[in-house]
Each structure stands twice: as structure tokens, then as C-alpha cells.
């Protein structure tokens, strides 16, 4: 099938032959992601992914992380990754556990961005970053 | 640390019950989301609501409860469920339970803690 | 809707004998998986989180393991106090308002 780079009922072209994002939106292994340049709170950027059909990035694999890191113009971006304080332990925003590291940690820093260094960044929740949303492509 | 409900009892079909948990050597924090569950007799568990125990007081609810069931924190210690139209099948014992939860933002984990319940009996 | 399917309902064991119980998850849980001991009158305790991280208190005879859909726990060295009832259930949260889904049951019945 013909793959366009314009439509006209909102998507865009991807990298997977009848597999499309909508306009704007990023693809990647399956999986649709937008990268906001307006900021927010942690909790407004969680709405603000809800109310596009999808959710905060959950970036559990190292290959999605620098498909990420390349496209984030050095900037911050909150995912979907929060401290369980309780817990002492990191989880997605799905519950599953996160194992690895989390840099400028911090007790008032629960929430976590990445894009400006290489890494993933404890940030405060309450900070407004940009966003990455993420859900499947059609 | 310890969770008990009361306001159990016998209803009438299409009555309405105000189930209420009491936790004791803890307060209703920012750590924890408060729960519903129920159980049959002889049966499964069946998740209802929680609600987060922090300022926000952020709840969320099993798609079959949306509109019967209402869960609320009325006071630091204290938690409840307002049931409406009760069916038979609404007849299990109501259990409350703990959950951790992260620093307020929807998501919530295992159950921890678990009172003993109270059972709900609808019948004419 | 996400379902936990739960096997076997009933399993007898001997004192000093092993049973395993399984929960398959209708989808991907990513390790999301709590299990739970129910003796009759009582409440539910938590034995097990994150598929395999033991509860506080809980004895190391209880193990948990699996990923993706497939998840097991392994009560080795039975002692008669292990019968009771043993549920899964997981804590993945796709978006949906189903959360918290419970498998059906298991009764471990020691001889």
C-alpha cells in the first residue's frame, strides 16, 4: 500500500507499512509518541496525555530510550515515572517496578523527566516540563 | 495497625447501606488509597473502589459500581461506602483494605492491610 | 477486560510436600502481581508482591515467579497452617477502570 507524508483525516505517515500516528505524533516500534512544547505540572500532564487517548511515556526499554533522547531537543520532559515514597521504589505509571537508575534524586523530587542528559531525572511533580505521551499506533 | 468495618446487616432488595471503616495505630495519609472489596459467600474477591486518603481525595471505582456505589473519607480515621438499589447479588461480605499508592497521583499498588468485613445480606 | 485465570481450583498436598499455583493474565502484566493466603473467617495477608518480593513476615517456603502473562507460587515444605485459600491478583493499570483484578481461587488442602 501507498504510504503518504500528508493526509487529510489527521495522521501521518509511519515507518511501518499500513501503520499510522496522528499528525504531529512520532512512531516507534509499534507505538505512537508526542512530544509537547507547552509545559505543565506532573499531574496536568497526566491529564493532559489522558485527554489525547494515551499516557505518560513509559520508557522501560533502552532502545526506546534513545529513539526518545534523539527527538527531545534538549529539553526536560516529564514520563511516566513516579517515586512510591512508601515503597522507596520507582514505578510506571502501569505499577510495574523500574530497576534501574534515577539521577538528582531527591525527597521532594517524585516524579522524573529525561531529554536533557542521557539519563532519567528525579524533577519535582509540581514543575512544570514538557511531556511525552505515548500510546499504540493504529 | 488494623482496619474494622461495621454497618452490616440485613437489607431489602432495592434498599441502601452506609458501610464504614475505621483504621487504628495509622491515619488516612498521602501513602495510602482506602478500599473496597467484597466476597460472596464461598466465592471470589471482587474489587469495588478506592479512594486516595491524601488532600486530593482522588477515587476510582470497578466500572460495575460507577453509580450504586459511593466511597468516601469522612474523617482521618475513617472511611465508608454508600451503597443504593441492592440487589441478591449484591449480597458478600464487604471487606476494607489498604493500598500503598505513590505521592497522590492515581496509582495505586497491592493490598497490604484488610479488616475482617462485615456482611451485607439483601434479601425480602 | 483484564482476567486472571487462576489454577487449580483444589490441590492436596502432604504435610512436607510442594503445590504450585497458577495465574495467567489475559495480557502483558509486567510483573504487577500480588498473591494473597485467605483462611476461612479471615481476611486476606499479603504473602507476595511484584510476582516474586516476599511480604514482611511471610517465610521464605513461599517463592513467586513468573513475567509477562504467566505467574506461579510455590509453597514448598508444607505445614499444615498453609491450608487456606491463595488468590492472585494484579495491579497493572492499562488506563481502563478494571483494575485490580483477582484471580478465582486456589484451596490448599494439606494431608
Known amino acids: 500500500p501507498q504510504i503518504f507524508n500528508k493526509s487529510n483525516d489527521g495522521f501521518t505517515t509511519t515507518r511501518s507499512y499500513g501503520t499510522v500516528c496522528p499528525k504531529d505524533w512520532e512512531f516507534y516500534q509499534a507505538r505512537c509518541f508526542f512530544l509537547s512544547t507547552s509545559e505543565s505540572s506532573w499531574n496536568e500532564s497526566r491529564d493532559f496525555c489522558k485527554g489525547k487517548g494515551s499516557t505518560l511515556a513509559i520508557v522501560n526499554t533502552p532502545e526506546k530510550l534513545k529513539f526518545l533522547q534523539d527527538i527531545t531537543d534538549a529539553e526536560k520532559y516529564f514520563i511516566g515515572l513516579i517515586y512510591h515514597r512508601e515503597e522507596k521504589r520507582w514505578r510506571w505509571i502501569n505499577n510495574s517496578v523500574f530497576n534501574g537508575n534515577v539521577t538528582n534524586q531527591n525527597q521532594n523530587f517524585n516524579c522524573a523527566t529525561i531529554g536533557l542528559t542521557k539519563t532519567f531525572d528525579a524533577a519535582s511533580c509540581d514543575i512544570s516540563y514538557r511531556r511525552i505521551c505515548e500510546k499504540n499506533a493504529k | 495497625q488494623s482496619l474494622e468495618e461495621s454497618g452490616g446487616g440485613l437489607v431489602k432488595p432495592e434498599g441502601s447501606l452506609t458501610l464504614t471503616c475505621k483504621a487504628s495505630?495509622?491515619?488516612?495519609?498521602?501513602?495510602?488509597?482506602m478500599c473496597w472489596v467484597r466476597q460472596a459467600p464461598g466465592k471470589g474477591l471482587e474489587w469495588i473502589a478506592c479512594?486516595?486518603?491524601?488532600?486530593?481525595?482522588?477515587t476510582v471505582y470497578a466500572s460495575w459500581a460507577k453509580g450504586r456505589f459511593t466511597i468516601s473519607k469522612t474523617s482521618s480515621t475513617t472511611v465508608t461506602l454508600q451503597m443504593t438499589s441492592l440487589t441478591a447479588a449484591d449480597t458478600a461480605t464487604y471487606l476494607c483494605?489498604?493500598?500503598?499508592?505513590?505521592?497522590?497521583?492515581?496509582?495505586?499498588?497491592?493490598?497490604?492491610?484488610w479488616g475482617p468485613g462485615t456482611l451485607v445480606t439483601v434479601s425480602s | 477486560a483484564l482476567v486472571m485465570t487462576q489454577t487449580p481450583s483444589s490441590v492436596s498436598a502432604a504435610v512436607g510436600g510442594t503445590v504450585t499455583i497458577k495465574c495467567q493474565a489475559s495480557q502483558n502484566i509486567y510483573s504487577t502481581l500480588a498473591w494473597y493466603q485467605q483462611k476461612p473467617g479471615q481476611p486476606p495477608k499479603l504473602l507476595m508482591f511484584?510476582?516474586?518480593d516476599l511480604a514482611s513476615g511471610v517465610p521464605s517456603r513461599f517463592k513467586g515467579s513468573g513475567s509477562g502473562t504467566e505467574y506461579t507460587l510455590t509453597i514448598s515444605d508444607l505445614e499444615p497452617a498453609d491450608a487456606a485459600t491463595y488468590f492472585c491478583q494484579t495491579y497493572y493499570d492499562s488506563g481502563s477502570d478494571d483494575l485490580n483484578a483477582f484471580g478465582g481461587g486456589t484451596e490448599v488442602v494439606v494431608k
Open positions: 483494605a489498604r493500598k500503598l499508592g505513590d505521592v497522590g497521583y492515581g496509582h495505586t499498588t497491592y493490598f497490604n492491610l
Open positions: 511484584d510476582a516474586s
Open positions: 479512594i486516595y486518603a491524601g488532600s486530593s481525595g482522588t
Open positions: 495505630g495509622f491515619t488516612l495519609s498521602s501513602y495510602y488509597y
